[in-house]
């Protein structure tokens, strides 16, 4: 008789990452009988929701339902109908919503209420929407990349599953850059974590991890740009801001009210004699870098050493995976190769920022001008943050791996979040590996 396929014994999970600039929906899949194995969960779909982040819907909450429809319908298609009711859905909102909550807790609650109402209308097992903490965002990002890299597995492999894997059980640090915050998370080497707020203790698969993490609110790439503009306009002699972080010939009008809308610019707020100003790009990497450094207060440190703004940072240790906007920006700039030194990256950024705006627009005709115009700033910001903010050096730069996906799953906090909420990371090493599921009989 012919071999007959058995129904796959698999499970699914959905996580929505409600970031400051956009929302993405991720669908994960795993063999049901291997839930506690490391590395068995993988991403089968990513759906990017059209439109801005959910915090931008504060004055139009009635539009949230439509906004989420396409990606939720996509989830309905991808996941077999028979499994809809048992598929958990989690929504985690990050720094964009943390900032909205700082402005108005009531408005943030309203947005989340409407999100919850909308997501409850689907046939899945909706588990609620919440604003995750910066500490969680860092921790779950660290769990994700190390889970996908097989760092929690006790089995030693003779092969590498990814090109930059350092074939040992030393965990990777995690560097995450969003639009409104950035996270740094790693296991320091025999170092006391001097600040309790930055210390996490995990027991995963029978091993203890003492992890350092910090989330810098307002230091995501978009909010850092707003900060820089608010700082620089303070000393502008008129309503023209000659900005080294934009290409020569680039011009853009900015409303002062938009500049001061975010809590991130409050420290630079002042009464200006104009309602609008014009950014005029001059495209100078070095000057841009200097301007960005002024956002990092390094004059005060109550610990043995700090990153910036008085935040404890232990000495860097081991390899790091840099993902989210670290990866997207560096990928666009063609700087993600393992072989590109920090000096070469700096040189390429100098050349890129100096290119005239008209030339840039022609070279990258398919890229939205809003995004295209900010790559000079974003690339310079990434270098400034990693080198001066986190104290990477030309040597330790070689230990930074710009990662988009690991084995088909996006690097980011969502997988770690789901693994935790579905109790799929055991504290102890599972005693025995269950028999793998046979597809054919």
């Amino acid at each position: 008789t012919q071999n007959k396929a058995l129904p796959e014994n698999v499970k699914y999970g959905i996580v929505l990452d409600a970031g400051s600039s956009h929302t993405s929906l991720y669908i994960y899949k795993w063999p049901a009988e291997k839930e506690n194995d490391t590395g068995v969960v993988h991403q089968v779909e990513e759906c990017r929701v059209k439109g801005p982040g959910i915090s931008k819907f504060v004055q139009k909450v009635n539009e949230i339902g439509i906004y989420l429809t396409d990606c939720m319908e996509r989830a309905r298609e991808v996941i077999p109908r028979s499994q809809h009711q048992e598929t958990p859905v989690y929504l985690g909102a990050t720094a964009g919503m943390r900032l909205l909550r700082m402005e108005s807790e009531e408005l943030a609650d309203r947005v989340l209420d409407v999100v919850e109402t909308s997501l409850s209308n689907y046939p899945f097992d909706f588990q609620g929407a919440r604003i995750i903490t910066g500490q969680e965002e860092g921790a779950y990002g660290w769990i994700t990349i190390n889970y996908l890299l097989g760092k929690f597995s006790q089995k030693t492999r003779w092969f590498s599953i990814v090109p930059y894997e350092t074939n040992n059980q030393e965990t990777f640090g995690a560097l995450d850059l969003g639009g409104a915050s950035t996270q740094v998370t790693f296991v320091p080497q025999n170092q006391t974590i001097e600040s309790p707020d930055n210390a996490l203790q995990f027991r995963l698969y029978g091993k203890d991890y003492n992890v350092y993490t910090h989330s810098f609110l307002c230091y995501g790439k978009d909010q850092a740009l707003w900060q820089k503009l608010a700082k620089d306009i303070q000393v502008a002699s008129n309503e023209i801001l000659r900005d080294p972080c934009f290409h020569p010939g680039y011009k853009k009008v900015v409303n002062v009210s938009d500049l001061y809308k975010t809590p991130c610019t409050k420290r630079f707020e002042m009464t200006l004699p104009f309602q609008q100003f014009e950014i005029q790009g001059i495209g100078n990497y070095q000057q841009c870098h200097q301007s960005i450094l002024e956002l990092f207060n390094t004059s005060y440190c109550p610990y043995s050493q700090c990153a910036f703004n008085g935040i404890f940072l232990p000495p860097l240790q081991g390899d790091f995976g840099a993902f989210s906007a670290f990866y997207f920006v560096m990928k666009f700039l063609n700087l993600t190769s393992e072989k590109v030194s920090q000096e070469k990256v700096t040189e390429m950024m100098k050349k890129f920022c100096a290119q005239p705006w008209e030339e840039i627009k022609t070279s990258y005709a398919g890229v939205k001008e809003k995004y295209l115009s900010e790559y000079c700033f974003s690339g310079t910001y990434i270098l400034s943050l990693l080198l001066q903010g986190y104290h990477f050096t030309a040597d330790s730069w070689e230990h930074i791996h710009f990662i988009g996906k690991i084995q088909g799953s996006d690097a980011g906090w969502t997988l770690g979040y789901m693994l935790n909420l579905t109790n799929m990371i055991p504290a102890e090493q599972p005693l025995s590996t269950p028999l793998s599921h046979s597809t054919y009989v």
Epitope: L112, T117, I131, T133
Partner: antibody
Framework: QVQLVQSGAEVKKPGASVKVSCKAS????????MHWVRQAPGQGLEWMGR????????WYAQKFQGRVTMTRDTSTSTVYMELSSLRSEDTAVYYC??????????????WGQGTLVTVSS | EIVLTQSPGTLSLSPGERATLSCRAS???????LAWYQQKPGQAPRLLIY???NRHTGIPDRFSGSGSGTDFTLTISRLEPEDFAVYYC????????FGGGTKVEIK
């Protein structure tokens, strides 16, 4: 819209227990903490404690520790407050009030209509 | 625990007048953790102000809150007939505590 509907008035004897319910609707039940506040006749407001409906964790005011138990039933979106060893000074209107989302601040946004508990021999 | 003392106990005013209610804490309270409630006879309290100065949804702009540290104030700029009620301040530090209340009555 958000509604908190409490159970009806109760008359109890000293030493007995009372269990007051508060049924929530119009929002995701697990997302907001629920608090209990009481008000003796002609007196001010007194906070008794709170419950996180998502995980069932509780936090009680010191005065009521050992005498109060707050529970929830997620299937019916209902929270309960049980007060034991009742005495005459427990005669009061008992209110449930919706608190914060995780990470928010502790103010009481929406209140139930109140349940009068009378303790009398 | 933090004790909140409200004064005056009773405030006798006419409609159209300005009411200023005080709430003093026994130790410093973060502004984000102070709220004001209004309660009318036979009704549940309702939230007016949170975070010391933020008006809750639907609360008229004649109600305003201010203050920091240990001294907080609720101001009703022009009393309307429906504003005559008891007002409570509330803080959160480790536990919630309420002030004793201020009754605003018609003169």
């Amino acid at each position: 819209q958000v509604q908190l509907v409490q159970s009806g008035a109760e008359v109890k004897k000293p030493g007995a227990s009372v269990k007051v319910s508060c049924k929530a609707s119009g929002y995701t039940f697990k997302s907001y903490e629920m608090h209990w506040v009481r008000q003796a006749p002609g007196q001010g407001l007194e906070w008794m404690g709170r419950i996180n409906p998502s995980v069932g964790s509780t936090w009680y005011a010191q005065k009521f520790q050992g005498r109060v138990t707050m529970t929830r039933d997620t299937s019916t979106s209902t929270v309960y407050m049980e007060l034991s060893s009742l005495r005459s000074e427990d005669t009061a209107v008992y209110y449930c009030a919706r608190g914060k989302r995780e990470g928010g601040t502790e103010y009481l946004r929406k209140w139930g209509q109140g349940t009068l508990v009378t303790v009398s021999s | 625990e933090i004790v909140l003392t409200q004064s005056p106990g009773t405030l006798s005013l006419s409609p159209g007048e300005r009411a200023t209610l005080s709430c003093r804490a026994s130790q410093s309270v973060a502004s984000s953790y102070l709220a004001w409630y209004q309660q009318k006879p036979g009704q549940a309290p309702r939230l007016l102000i949170y975070g010391a100065s933020n008006r809750h949804t639907g609360i008229p702009d004649r109600f305003s809150g201010s203050g920091s540290g240990t001294d907080f104030t609720l101001t009703i700029s022009r009393l309307e007939p429906e504003d005559f009620a008891v007002y409570y301040c509330q803080q959160y530090h480790n536990a919630i505590t309420f002030g004793g209340g201020t009754k605003v009555e018609i003169k």
